[in-house]
Amino acid sequence: PEPPTACREKQYLINSQCCSLCQPGQKLVSDCTEFTETECLPCGESEFLDTWNRETHCHQHKYCDPNLGLRVQQKGTSETDTICTCEEGWHCTSEACESCVLHRSCSPGFGVKQIATGVSDTICEPCPVGFFSNVSSAFEKCHPWTSCETKDLVVQQAGTNKTDVVCGPQDRLRA
């Protein structure tokens, strides 16, 4: 007889026969025949398959290598891969998160606009007029200059984007 030319969803064509695909979490052991089912077996420990498939081998779970700054964010199952993220203070170098780099620090004159996460680096911004940062930091925002007036003091030294203003006592006018 002529073979089927197309099989249904979750089926595949082999030897002129439609066979059921193996469900996620299982691998193919043997193809079906007209009167036998597709034979599938569950993936082993530390293995997975995340789609309906006809794979004869399961994929290994991703290894989150601590030597690359990685740790497990979500443990893999027979149907899902392990998800890695970076240790505190580090972030992934790519979407696949195969390695990590240290969070960038914002230099003096720059403040943190957005603190880094496990997947994104620190975003820095220049301190605008009226603000300063005198440290290299991955957390510190730009600080506002001290208001000498509210302390009944006067500006003795103007602030910059890296230094605060220096306040001093007001000169007393002599009679």
């Epitope: 007889p1 002529e2 073979p3 089927p4 099989c7 249904r8 089926q11 026969q17 439609c18 066979c19 059921s20 193809d31 079906c32 025949t33 007209e34 009167f35 036998t36 089912e37 597709t38």
Partner: nanobody, 124 residues
Framework: QVQLVESGGGLVQPGGSLRLSCSAS????????MAWFRQAPGKERDFVAA????????YYADSVKGRFTISRDNSKNTLYLQMSSLRAEDTAVYYC?????????????????WGQGTQVTVSS
Amino acid sequence: QVQLVESGGGLVQPGGSLRLSCSASGRAFNTYTMAWFRQAPGKERDFVAAISRDGTITYYADSVKGRFTISRDNSKNTLYLQMSSLRAEDTAVYYCAARRVGAVPERESAYEHWGQGTQVTVSS
């Protein structure tokens, strides 16, 4: 896609014979594994017999072995069930079914296409 229409049912006396037909319209009848199922009043639908695409392999439920014969004529797009030595317990609606996926003969859920059924009543 195939449409199935059963015929040949009716009232027959115990020990009698009947031949059911299942006419398939649509293309590529010979790409389908075919089967007969039956459903007695108030019971589940049960497997009766199945036949391979080329007609060379057949399977039967134990309850009908030696009494029923399944056959097909691919040139006429027709499936048959020859029933003899009929018993009261053979009374049921008989359905023909078609599938393309490989599966054990009796797995009802594997069959993708079904006819409307034909009534067989065995009674004196």
